[in-house]
């Protein structure tokens, strides 16, 4: 990216960059970011009593410490380790739900099926969901004007590295049968470049995970194709099988009915396919 090239070519120290140079292509830190993180933490520990031991001020301090005063294109997973340690949480075996490009339905599902968990149902995922943040090198400021964009500026930015770190950890700790919800309306139902495809798939532990079950969510009402035969799903099956994890795939032809049947499994219409 442009700034990194400047550093390499001219060996400019980060703190020597004029303030006007630190303009990024992405939107700035979410308004009231510190207050939002702290409030979310307090709410989470109240709604999840098993996490009542968590000190939310310490969580915010660790979160802040991961990116404040650091050049926002040089963030590492190591920077987030204190936060990850404070947010350590376990999911019972068979209860992990991963998702790719279909976040809303995955979250609607776990709101009904309360014993299953996406990353955003965990403390750290809940804290950061839909937020943006970054700091500035050698100042204690949060940058509310702009933050690095993954494509246009750099991939090692505070937000991207955070999600890579917590996604890796979430996958590493999964056990039993792991489920993943995939968007059947996308050209690449399984995308190797998504967080699921690039991080989570490769960090499932074969000694703990018996199987990965993919739920391919259909978009169109009249779509009766077997999307489990899609080439990208076959690619996912190949990756998973090579890691000695069994793979299963299921078409969810009617996501609306699927959710309704999760809510009311006794409904007579739920005995037929969804």
């Amino acid at each position: 990216s442009g700034l990194n090239d400047i550093f390499e070519a001219q060996k400019i120290e980060w703190h020597e960059l004029p303030r006007w140079r630190q303009q990024w292509s992405g939107s700035g830190t979410t308004s009231r970011f510190p207050e939002t993180v702290l409030a979310r933490c307090v709410k989470y520990t109240e709604v999840h009593p098993e996490m009542r031991h968590v000190d939310c001020q310490s969580v915010w301090d660790a979160f802040k410490g991961a990116f404040i005063s650091k050049y926002p294109c040089n963030i590492t997973e190591e920077d987030y380790q204190p936060l990850v340690k404070l947010g350590t949480q376990t999911v019972p075996c068979n209860k992990t739900l991963l998702w790719s490009r279909i976040k809303d339905l995955a979250h609607q599902f776990t709101q009904v099926q309360r014993d299953m968990f996406t990353l955003e149902d965990m403390l750290l995922g809940y804290l950061a969901d839909d937020l943006t943040w970054c700091g500035e090198f050698n100042t204690f400021e949060i940058n509310y004007q702009s933050c690095p964009d993954w494509r246009k500026d750099c991939s090692n930015n505070p937000v991207s590295v955070f999600w890579k770190t917590v996604s890796r950890r979430f996958a590493e700790t999964a056990c039993g049968v792991v489920h993943v919800m995939l968007n059947g309306s996308r050209s690449k139902i399984f995308d190797k470049n998504s967080t699921f495809g690039s991080v989570e798939v490769h960090n499932l532990q074969p000694e703990k995970v018996q199987a990965l079950e993919a739920w391919v969510i259909h978009g169109g009402r009249e779509d009766s194709r077997d999307l489990c035969q899609d080439p990208t799903i076959k690619e996912l099956e190949s990756i998973i099988s090579k890691r000695n994890i069994r793979f299963f795939c299921k078409n969810i032809y009617r996501p609306d009915k699927f959710l309704q049947c999760v809510k009311n499994p006794e409904d007579s219409s739920c005995l037929s396919g969804i």
Epitope: E46, V47, H48, P49, E50, R52, H53, Q89, T90, P92, C93, K95, R114, D115
Partner: antibody, heavy 114, light 113 residues
């Protein structure tokens, strides 16, 4: 630091009863508080608890039969429609970070009989 | 619903002997270690002995120890004293959104001869 239960007495079946747990030496806004009961000669049974911000959680068997609420100085347990099976000593306990109770009251006896 | 099964229901021990009480959960407790042990003497409220499987509560003698993980847990009293005659209860913690937050075992009565 201590907790103490009060309000236990003899009631007839179906007559609502409210027990109160009063805390001394610590703030109820800083702790979850739990209710546990013990029928004569039997084991401990967790009823439910109330969070720092008054979110309540109940054992599956206790839902609808009990209501937990709090003020700044006390935590109440309402037995909505007592039956003879609700005869027990009712304990209030402070819930700490890693267990169901690091501080318990002496208990208050509720007898349900016609 | 989750169940915690304590064995034995009653045990007799000589002063100076060792007592072992088992607690088996029907599903893993939260974080595989969120299990506590309580002691209750007749006419008194329960007293916390051990939390998080093996951590000794404040003021509890070191002859009490806990071990285990997941669904299988043990309370051991080494060098039993007459003062240890009481009922002992295990208590497991689970994720509240999908289960009862806390569940007690049925209890074990320890008689000291």
């Amino acid at each position: 630091q201590s907790v103490e239960e009060s309000g236990g007495r003899l009631v007839t079946p179906g007559t609502p009863l409210t027990l109160t747990c009063t805390a001394s030496g610590f703030s109820l806004s800083s702790y979850y508080m739990s209710w546990v009961r013990q029928a004569p000669g039997k084991g401990l049974e967790w009823i439910g608890f109330i969070s720092k911000t008054a979110i309540t959680y109940y054992a599956s068997w206790a839902r609808g039969r009990f209501t937990i609420s709090k003020t700044s100085t006390a935590v109440d347990l309402k037995i909505t429609s007592p039956t003879t099976e609700d005869t027990a000593t009712y304990f209030c306990a402070r819930v700490d970070a890693y267990s169901a109770g690091d501080l318990w009251g002496p208990g208050t006896l509720v007898t349900v009989s016609s | 619903a989750q169940v915690l099964t304590q064995t034995p229901s009653s045990v007799s021990a000589a002063v100076g002997g060792t007592v072992t009480i088992n607690c088996q959960a029907s599903q893993s407790v939260y974080s595989d270690n969120r299990l506590s042990w309580f002691q209750q003497k007749s006419g008194q409220p329960p007293k916390l002995l051990i939390y998080s499987t093996s951590s000794l509560a404040s003021g509890v003698p070191s002859r009490f120890s806990g071990s285990g993980s997941g669904t299988q847990f043990t309370l051991t009293i080494s060098g039993v004293q007459s003062d240890d005659a009481a009922s002992y209860y295990c208590q497991g913690e689970f994720i509240c959104t999908s289960a009862d937050c806390f569940v007690f075992g049925g209890g074990t009565e320890v008689v000291v001869k």
